[in-house]
């Protein structure tokens, strides 16, 4: 069934019904050079063939030039993310030219019509870039197109149509409907710029996916798996507004891509790292925290150029707000025996203790099942920098947290009524930090006591022999 979309109807209806009553207007695209960090400043409008505004408004031919391209609009006004992004670019790149591509009249239409207008707008941008290329010292290599939602595909068209190759395109949650699975010349793709990096924050495998699911760049980054963004759940939205709606959730998750990019501009000292992985499930298992062979990268503005032969899907976890950076850890727990496990999977929590801080109690997400006589890998992440890890507390939760687990426990009891206590043996935990690439091994405090059972905890300290595998470092990322 269709996803509801607030009090005004369903999501599908929103895609086909702009709020404005339309009148016949000539299609128009404007280029506004943002000459001030003050969002209220009117800036300077540039037009092909007119050199005077370039001089009057101090367009810097040798500097970087950013083109910000908005997406489909229901209101016909620039949304608030725009001036946040403009301001962040001005802060980070003081000499740069920041140009807003205003295609509101063509975007404030039925979604399907707006999609059909993306090609025209891409052409307009390409014409502007071709004209600028005629000027001395202007280089396409210094051009960075930043497109949000439908604007990402506009950027793709612009990169495709321009004479030459633009330096970079960043796609901020490129639009999904009518682009998913489309031919590479009808959507953003790696051949549209020298470097195409993409952030996917609202992808859905069910219902309507506002953002495109497929990889469309040289690197495609899927924060939090590219779907459910922290701080954007209905509960979070309900907490911040009197009557939260699905609309707010959609906006929050879709726009999260913009905020992650803004964060990368203004919180340069707190870079977020993403790690290459074949899929979200493997990442959740903690398998993919390597920086070898360009397998990790900064996200957003600080991303290092990678031109892979095929798309590189990368994943990371984030906080719910700026700064978004978290610290990722891979935990390898070797379970060498267990007793009377029954059907039910244990619920484990870890607390990490470091030289800088201690973590909260973190759940170990069991993606499939706990394997015995095998190494089980988990991903945990902390919001604070713990420093060097000193010890780990592993807790096996006692009482069942769900009716399903309770039922399984009850069934286990019926089949084995005199079931002795469930128990599991763990000697050591191997930990790898995603951010520093350091690996450490932690042993049980008491080598004689390696068993853990429901409601109990086990403490691990750095092994006495200081067992440490050689550090992996990445050539593409300056690790903090």
């Amino acid at each position: 069934s269709p996803v509801p979309f607030g009090p005004e109807g369903r999501l599908e209806d929103k895609l086909h019904k702009p709020k404005a009553t339309q009148t016949e207007v000539k299609p128009s695209v404007r280029f506004n050079l943002r000459t001030s960090k003050d969002p209220e400043h009117e800036g300077c409008y540039l037009s092909v063939g007119h050199s005077q505004p370039l001089e009057d408004c101090s367009f810097n031919m040798t500097a970087k030039t950013f083109f910000i391209i908005h997406g489909w609009t229901m209101s016909g006004i620039f949304e608030n993310w725009l001036h946040k992004l403009v301001s962040a670019l001005h802060t980070r790149e003081k000499d740069a030219n920041v140009v807003v591509v205003d295609w509101l009249p063509l975007a404030h239409q039925l979604y399907t019509d707006a999609v059909n207008n993306t090609r025209v707008v891409g052409h307009s941008i390409a014409r502007m870039l071709d004209w600028l290329q005629e000027k001395d010292d202007f280089s396409l290599g210094n051009v960075h197109l930043i497109g949000y939602s439908l604007g990402a595909h506009v950027a793709g068209y612009a990169g495709n149509f321009v004479k030459g190759t633009v330096g970079r395109i960043t796609g901020l949650d490129p639009a999904g409907p009518m682009f998913e699975g489309a031919d590479i010349h009808k959507r953003l793709s790696p051949d549209d710029a020298d470097f195409v990096d993409v952030l996917h924050t609202y992808t859905r495998s069910f219902g309507l996916s506002i953002g495109i699911q497929m990889p469309v760049g040289h690197i495609d980054i899927y924060p939090n798996g590219g779907d459910f963004q922290p701080g954007c759940g209905l509960n979070d939205v309900l907490g911040s507004i009197a009557y939260g709606t699905i609309t707010e959730v959609v906006k929050c998750e879709h726009e999260r891509a913009v905020h992650l990019f803004v964060d990368s501009l203004v919180n340069q000292d707190k870079p977020s790292f993403a790690f290459q992985c074949t899929d979200s499930n493997r990442f959740k298992k903690g398998i993919c925290l390597s920086c070898r062979k360009n397998r990790c990268n900064s996200i957003g503005y600080n991303a290092k150029k990678m031109r892979n032969k095929r798309n590189s899907k990368m994943y990371l976890k984030t906080r719910a707000g700026m700064p978004f950076r978290v610290y990722h850890y891979q935990m390898k727990i070797h379970v060498f025996s267990y007793k009377n496990m029954g059907e039910i999977e244990p619920t484990f929590y870890v607390t990490l203790y470091g030289t800088n801080a201690d973590s909260q109690t973190l759940p170990l997400e069991i993606v499939e099942r706990i394997e015995q006589n095998a190494t089980n890998t988990f991903l945990v992440y902390t919001e604070e920098d713990l420093g060097d890890l000193l010890k780990i507390q592993l807790t096996w939760e006692g009482a069942s947290q769900s009716w399903y687990n309770l039922w399984k426990e009850f069934r286990s009891y019926l089949s084995q009524p005199r079931n002795p206590g469930r128990e599991l043996n763990i000697r050591r935990i191997r930990v790898k930090s995603g951010e520093t690439q350091r690996k450490l091994t932690f042993c049980t405090e008491d080598p004689e006591n390696t068993s853990i059972s429901p409601g109990r905890e086990l403490w691990f300290r750095k092994c006495r022999d200081g067992w440490r595998m050689k550090n992996e470092t990445s050539p593409t990322v300056e690790l903090p």
Epitope: A20, Q22, S28, R30, E40, H41, I77, N80, K84, P105
Partner: antibody, heavy 120, light 112 residues
Framework: QIQLVQSGPELKKPGETVKISCKAS????????MNWVKQAPGKDLKWMGW????????TYADDFKGRFAFSLETSASTAYLQINNLKNEDTATYFC?????????????WGQGTTLTVSS | DIVLTQSPASLAVSLGQRATISCKAS??????????MNWYQQKPGQPPQLLIY???NLGSGIPARFSGSGSGTDFTLNIHPVEEEDAATYYC??????????FGGGTKLEIK
């Protein structure tokens, strides 16, 4: 200096049409959006909608869809509000007010207001 | 639509004292650290004049005795010290990026 100058007071009968003008000066007309706001006698302010002064695309608040029309004469830096099939409840002062496309959408300059009286 | 509720509907303040006007929104008007709440002053027979934008920023040419504060759903306009010429009706106005934009019901300030 920046000014929005509106046309004078109007006295109309129910069923008639009125067209109120708002002439802008002191800035580039097409670089700012234009709002229309209604204030009935002794009542609060009610946002009617806005028009994109570059593209001419109007957006109407729900209560002002149908009989109300925003238009432009860009060459004269003038925005218009037309109300068709006037009703007694249209009696009010109508203000035009500009806002920045790129900013936080507050209304920084207002016209002096046009008083419309609808009476048989 | 976001509903703005102003209180009190009217108040009388002595010259030189503080006037405090409250505006409560039916849902948050915040976005990424900014509050899209504005305040206007309207005197009889005149158009409204911008006093405060984005919750706490002073409009052009507005004296420093006017100040705004608040975030989320609760906002306040303070005038201190109140002067004779401040007798007017004050309106709050939300300008989030999802119109319709709405105004509060107004607060009439009288100087004693």
């Amino acid at each position: 200096q920046i000014q929005l100058v509106q046309s004078g007071p109007e006295l109309k009968k129910p069923g008639e049409t009125v067209k109120i003008s708002c002439k802008a000066s002191g800035y580039t007309f097409t670089n700012y959006g234009m709002n229309w706001v209604k204030q009935a006698p002794g009542k609060d302010l009610k946002w009617m909608g806005w028009i994109n002064t570059y593209s001419g695309v109007p957006t109407y608040a729900d209560d002002f869809k149908g009989r109300f029309a925003f238009s432009l004469e860009t060459s004269a830096s003038t925005a218009y509000l037309q109300i068709n099939n006037l009703k007694n409840e249209d009696t009010a002062t109508y203000f035009c007010a500009r806002f920045s496309y790129y900013g936080r959408h507050y209304f920084d300059y207002w016209g002096q207001g046009t008083t419309l009286t609808v009476s048989s | 639509d976001i509903v703005l509720t102003q209180s009190p509907a009217s108040l009388a303040v002595s010259l030189g004292q503080r006037a405090t006007i409250s505006c409560k929104a039916s849902q948050s008007v915040d976005y990424d650290g900014d509050s899209y709440m504005n305040w206007y002053q309207q005197k009889p027979g005149q158009p409204p004049q911008l006093l405060i934008y984005a919750a706490s920023n002073l409009g052009s040419g507005i004296p420093a005795r006017f100040s705004g504060s608040g975030s989320g759903t609760d906002f306040t306009l303070n005038i201190h010290p109140v002067e004779e010429e401040d007798a007017a009706t004050y309106y709050c106005h939300q300008s989030t990026d999802d119109p319709p934009w709405t105004f509060g019901g107004g607060t009439k300030l009288e100087i004693k």
